[in-house]
Interface confidence: medium
């Protein structure tokens, strides 16, 4: 009697199930007892003998790729061999890889964590993700895995993480990179400074008086405002950042304390109050304001 | 500042064994791909082997006029790579380059010279 | 084994010219290529991957460009300093394989 194997499918791709059939085309199963065993190369397959002549693979992997065959055993013990059968794995190139951020859309606040997912649409296999950061060439990061998609986290995100960023997947067809994905670090507004600038060392009333705030930290565009005894003077917008002024013409009524407030949409700050006083120097006629 | 310093280099008779060195500073070791680059004037620039980082289970790619007879590997607590050369020939003679980097060679170091001579 | 292949040893030019180094993959690598500046007795340094992405610190006077199996280096407004061996250099698949140089010369 012969003995064939069959693989279905023959030619079976990465990560799919196999079913090895042990078949005897002259022999009704009724007409004997037979054990059978399935063999790739030399190491035997599965539960080793077993009565049915059938093996199921749940997946198969390129490193599957190689020589099969099986063996039919009879209750007197003859054995017969089947031909070796070649079963070649087929590997899925990677393809469309992307990037995509969590949270969505690349915004993230400073100290906020970041999720770098790369994606890639098909392929097989282990992949190797790689992670790069602008025109850096060495990569962030590297994962080998059986998986469409990987994560590169930064747990707490600072100003310098604010760039481009791609990732790179490959799986031993070359490398395929995604697209550019930019990264914008928002940062809430640091608590900021009132500085008060006159024309002169000692001003004097209906001179012009200069209120300028800074905040030294945070994302455009700032909003400030002004307050003279927590009454709004006005406010000024700084659109690219940096500090903004708002100036005074001088009267005796100014004097008391000033401050100023900053806003970016992420949160507010207040300065510190600067105190303004007017004097009256000993031997001069005109009133003078000192802070 | 990143420096990458081959040692190891010399005379060797064909046939004969020779290990190479490479010592890293300035970068992130541990996540770097590690390759050696040679250089003949018969033969120009040469990818030698591959080394690849933890995170991709250390694998190693080897050109064929190497394989069997090179072996790349590394110390991330060290900052080091090395390439062990057994049987080696006539045609490996050439300044072998220690090289950082994924597919492209950002870092090189200075090269060390193998001159494989009867 | 895929073959880079730069057609021209020597290129001749003049400081303050255009000058265009070609490279022919012997099959289609897509954009999967690196271009190396050496100046003698030095090692090589990186100044272009993916084809045409410029490496951090490298002037734009350099440009890469191309895909598939014809890639170009141009420099244009050459400098003194940029007289030196190019190579170009193929990832698409090991081994990773090198062009056999062109050496930029003053005319």
């Known amino acids: 009697a012969e003995l064939f194997l069959i693989a279905s499918p023959s030619h079976p791709t990465e990560g799919s199930p196999v079913t090895l059939t042990c078949k005897m085309p002259f022999l009704q199963s009724s007409d004997a007892q037979f054990q059978f065993c399935f063999f790739r190369d030399t190491r035997a397959l599965g539960p080793g003998w077993s009565s049915s002549p059938k093996l199921q693979i749940a997946a198969m992997w390129k490193e599957d790729t190689g020589s099969y065959w099986c063996e039919a055993q009879t209750m007197a013990s003859k054995v017969l061999r089947s031909r070796r059968s070649q079963i070649n794995v087929h590997r899925v190139p990677v393809a469309d890889v992307s990037l995509e951020t969590q949270p969505p859309g690349g915004q993230v606040m400073e100290g906020d964590r970041l999720v770098l997912i790369c994606s890639v649409a098909m392929g097989t296999g282990d992949i190797t993700f790689l992670w790069y950061k602008g025109a850096v060439g060495l990569n962030l990061q590297s994962k080998t895995q059986r998986s469409l998609t990987a994560e590169y986290e930064i747990p707490s995100v600072r100003e310098s993480d604010a760039e481009q960023y791609y990732c790179v997947a490959e799986n031993g067809y070359g490398p395929s990179p995604s697209g550019l994905v930019s990264i914008t670090v928002r940062i809430p507004v640091s608590r900021p400074i009132l500085m008060l600038r006159a024309p002169r060392a000692q001003a004097a009333v209906e001179d012009v008086l200069e209120l300028h705030c800074e905040a030294l930290r945070g994302s455009p565009p700032i909003l400030y405002w002004f307050y003279h005894e927590d009454i709004t003077l006005g406010s000024r917008s700084a659109p690219s950042g940096g500090g903004a002024s708002f100036n005074l013409s001088l009267t005796e009524e100014h004097s008391g304390n000033y401050s100023c407030e900053a806003n970016n949409g992420l949160g507010a700050q207040r300065s510190e109050a600067v105190t303004l006083n007017f004097t009256v120097p000993t031997g001069a006629r005109s009133n003078h304001l000192t802070s | 500042e990143v420096k990458l310093e081959e040692s190891g280099g010399g005379l060797v008779q064909p046939g004969g064994s020779m290990k190479l060195s490479c010592a890293a500073s300035g970068f992130t070791f541990g996540d770097a791909w590690m390759d050696w680059v040679r250089q003949s004037p018969e033969k120009g620039l040469e990818w030698v082997a591959e080394i690849r980082s933890k995170a991709n289970n250390h694998a190693t790619y080897y050109a064929e006029s190497v394989k069997g007879r090179f072996t790349i590997s590394r110390d991330d607590s060290k900052s080091s790579v090395y390439l062990q050369m057994n049987s080696l020939r006539v045609e490996d003679t050439g300044i072998y380059y220690c090289?950082?980097?994924?597919?492209?060679?950002?870092?090189w170091g200075q090269g060390t010279l193998v001159t494989v001579s009867a | 084994d895929i073959v880079m292949t730069q057609s021209h040893k020597f290129m001749s030019t003049s400081v303050g010219d255009r000058v265009s180094i070609t490279c022919k993959a012997s099959q289609d690598v897509g954009s999967t290529v690196a271009w190396y500046q050496q100046n003698p007795g030095q090692s090589p340094k990186l100044l272009i991957y993916?084809?045409?992405t410029r490496h951090t610190g490298v002037p734009d006077r350099f440009t890469g460009s191309g895909s598939g199996t014809d890639f170009i280096l141009t420099i244009s407004n050459v400098q003194s300093e940029d007289l030196a061996d190019y190579f170009c250099q193929q990832y698409s698949s090991y081994p990773f394989t090198f062009g056999s140089g062109t050496k930029l010369e003053i005319k």
């Open positions: 993916w084809a045409s």
């Open positions: 090289t950082g980097g994924n597919y492209w060679f950002v870092y």
